[in-house]
């Protein structure tokens, strides 16, 4: 277990012409926060996909308004830094993403607005307890400046925070209730199997199965405490000879990290180390926080106002859900019209157009007879968003662009034979038939049942189809 | 409003197991860690371990380790609790109930009666 | 563990009286303690959370106070529908444990 820290150093705009006077300009006051996301391993991961080593909000900073005169400043930044703890092992190779907020305080309509200003992304190697690694990164016109290193949580040591120390020598001649002047040194290396029920606390072994005191506790589990000590009978408050010190009331006394925290002094004061899902100056704060990076498809992670109101994800254009999880069904609003096909490509919505049907949503219906479409002499009929062409004889197909076979429909009755003509069919009938199409049977008696044929044409002539 | 729905009563043969079951309506289920509580009759509350959907961390209390095992089926936001070799002394009430983010249970289950009897 | 006590098992109160029950740990919690009360019908309801805040909806007459080991829930004027069991309840590491429980019972 461990915790990898960011501090940034300095965000402004960067060197050369074209780069921005500041976050803010004509927008009103705003201010800058950043969020860390930590990434296992060196692939290239899709922009989307979790923070799986872990991530961090800052503070926001000082509000910051632009003074139009004054040279561009290096812009406030929130004070501190940002913490990722991680609890297994460090892997040593990873990805850092950093991203700059700007929040802008203006007047907007439903409270603040963030925008994301810059995003930083780099593959990096780094042993856990290592020095700080500087760095310099450029996003666009911006430059970011930022220290970064991971250190590892005692009993957790070596470079990727998998060894666990003991004390190498008898911690200190100290009695009970009384600590050590000085930190002790550390052997590092994996612990033997103690005794089953050896005090975690006053106990350890360096073989397997024992189970050996430290000073000021016995018994065969190290329960018992020891009621001399060597430190005892000191009227001062410290004894250089003993190296012993009565305890003052140190900064983790009466323990005030809640749900299992544990406690270790800083420099007049106390850090809580949190176990997971529990966040906070003193571990109070459970469940689920933008600690987690819990906000999907980069959406920004906002803390609620009050202590029980859970964070916020603000989403990207396309994506929704309390997490940002789903991807927005553009498509189900039918922004296509006139039967288009639409495509949700993640950046943008494309439609695919029906013939007859042009324009970004399909909106213009194209007038497909203004370009004269039907060859031949047809006509062309529009409607429904296609066109229709309406041949002259002897010419088909969509354009009437096909010479057409008048005789390939067999259109001649009872056995006529059929003949193409240059404007047309003739149908020669067969005895007994007449008509245009040899419709009409002859009567044996030479009576037609039909008016008496036009003058010129005398039934069995081949007659032709007008 | 936050809703944790438990069903009323189950009856249960000694030595077998039993798996109770706490549907969460009305907060993102994932965020909270939901805690399980128990109660014998005529006695006080005892707490028997919590988790967390959104990363199936959990705490047991260690009187409670072998005794139950706490999951969560976050598709339909219901957390679960199995109870395994059951004997009379696991005749109780079993509450399932939410922890606020300041550490506080805020919203109770109505509590699942078990009785083991042969 | 930590041992959450609550001396008073049960105590006879009359509508309108000023109630205050007890809870102490066996080491400083650093107030890190819920009280919770439980209705006849088994219905548990948090009252105060982090040893004085009260809980949303919760009425005001419910208050508590303390520090280091020692704890306290007053009820400034009982109404009926007060007459129930209240627990104290730690959260400074695990095991949570919950104190033994103080029914309210009128007189």
């Known amino acids: 277990a461990g915790v990898f820290e960011l501090q940034i150093h300095s965000f402004g705009p960067g060197p050369g012409p074209g780069a921005p006077r500041s976050p803010c300009s004509a927008r009103g006051p705003c201010r800058l926060f950043f969020r860390v996301c930590l990434k296992p391993g060196l692939s290239e991961e899709a922009a989307e996909s979790p923070c799986a080593l872990g991530a961090a909000l800052s503070a926001r900073g000082p509000v910051y308004t632009e003074q139009p005169e004054a040279p561009a400043p290096d812009l406030p930044l929130p004070n501190g830094l940002l913490q990722v703890p991680f609890r297994d092992a460090w892997p040593g190779t990873f990805s850092l993403i950093i991203e700059t907020w700007r929040e802008e305080l203006g007047d907007q309509i439903g409270g603040p607005a963030w925008s994301l200003l810059a995003r930083v992304t780099r593959r990096r190697r780094l042993a856990a307890g290592g020095p700080w690694a500087r760095d310099i990164q450029r996003a666009g016109a911006w430059e970011l400046r930022f220290s970064y290193r991971a250190r590892c949580e005692l009993p957790a040591v070596g470079t990727a925070c998998t060894r666990l120390c003991r004390p190498r020598s008898a911690p200190s001649r100290c009695g009970p209730g009384l600590r050590p002047c000085a930190p002790l040194e550390d052997e590092c290396e994996a612990p033997p199997v103690c005794r089953a029920g050896c005090s975690l606390e006053h106990g350890f072994c360096e073989q397997p199965g024992e189970c050996r005191c430290l000073e000021g506790w016995t018994g065969p589990l190290c329960m018992v405490p020891v009621s001399t000590s060597s430190c005892l009978g000191l009227r001062g408050p410290s004894s250089t000879t003993t190296g012993c010190l009565v305890p003052g009331p140190g900064p983790c006394d009466g323990n005030p990290c809640a749900n299992g925290g544990s406690c270790s002094e800083t420099p007049g004061s106390f850090e809580c180390t949190c176990p997971r899902g529990f966040y906070g100056l003193r571990c109070e704060v459970s469940g689920v926080t933008c600690a987690d990076g819990p906000c999907f498809n980069g959406g920004l992670c906002v803390g609620g106002a009050d202590p029980d109101s859970a964070y916020i994800c603000h989403c990207p254009p396309g994506f929704q859900g309390s997490n940002c999880e789903k991807r927005v069904d553009r498509c189900s609003l039918q922004p296509c019209r006139n039967g288009g096909l639409c495509l949700d490509l993640g950046h943008a919505l494309r439609c695919r157009c029906r013939a007859g049907f042009a324009g970004p949503r399909c909106e213009h219906d194209l007038d497909d007879c203004a370009g004269r479409a039907c060859a031949n002499g047809g006509t062309c009929v529009e409607g429904g968003g296609a066109h229709r062409c309406s041949c002259a004889l002897g010419f088909g197909g969509r354009n009437c662009r096909e010479r057409a076979d008048p005789c390939a429909a067999r259109p001649c009755a009872h056995g006529g034979r059929c003949y193409a003509h240059f404007s047309g069919l003739v149908c020669a009938c067969a005895p007994g038939y007449m008509g245009a199409r040899c419709e009409f049977p002859v009567h044996p008696d030479g009576v037609s049942a039909l008016p008496a044929a036009p003058p010129g044409l005398r039934p069995g002539d081949p007659q032709r189809y007008l | 409003q936050v809703q944790l729905q438990q069903p009323g009563a189950e009856l249960v043969k000694p030595g077998t197991s039993v798996k109770l079951s706490c549907e969460a309506s009305?907060?993102?289920?994932?965020?909270?860690?939901m805690q399980w509580v128990r109660q014998r009759p005529g006695q006080g509350l005892e707490w028997i371990g919590m988790?967390?959907?959104?990363?199936?961390?959990?705490n047991y209390n260690e009187n409670f380790q072998t005794k139950a095992t706490l999951t969560v089926d976050k598709s339909s936001s219901t957390a679960y609790m199995q109870l395994s070799s059951l004997t009379s002394e696991d005749s109780a009430v079993y509450y399932c109930?939410?922890?606020?983010?300041?550490?506080?249970?805020?919203?109770w289950g109505q509590g699942t009666s078990v009785t083991v009897s042969s | 563990d930590i041992q959450m006590t609550q001396t008073t098992s049960s105590l006879s109160v009359s509508l309108g009286d000023r109630v205050t029950i007890n809870c102490s740990a066996s080491?400083?919690?650093?107030?890190?303690l819920n009280w919770y009360q439980q209705k006849p019908d088994g219905t548990v309801k948090l009252l105060i959370y982090?040893?004085?805040n009260l809980h949303s909806g919760v009425p005001s007459r419910f208050s508590g106070s303390g520090s280091g080991t020692d704890y306290s829930l007053t009820i400034s004027n009982l109404e009926p529908e007060d007459i129930a069991t209240y627990y104290c309840?730690?959260?400074?590491?695990?095991?949570?444990?919950f104190g033994g429980g103080t029914k309210l019972e009128i007189k």
């Open positions: 009305g907060y993102t289920f994932s965020n909270y860690w």
């Open positions: 988790i967390l959907p959104n990363s199936d961390i959990t």
């Open positions: 109930a939410r922890q606020a983010r300041y550490s506080a249970m805020d919203y």
């Open positions: 080491q400083g919690i650093s107030n890190y």
């Open positions: 982090y040893t004085s």
């Open positions: 309840q730690h959260y400074s590491k695990f095991p949570y444990t």
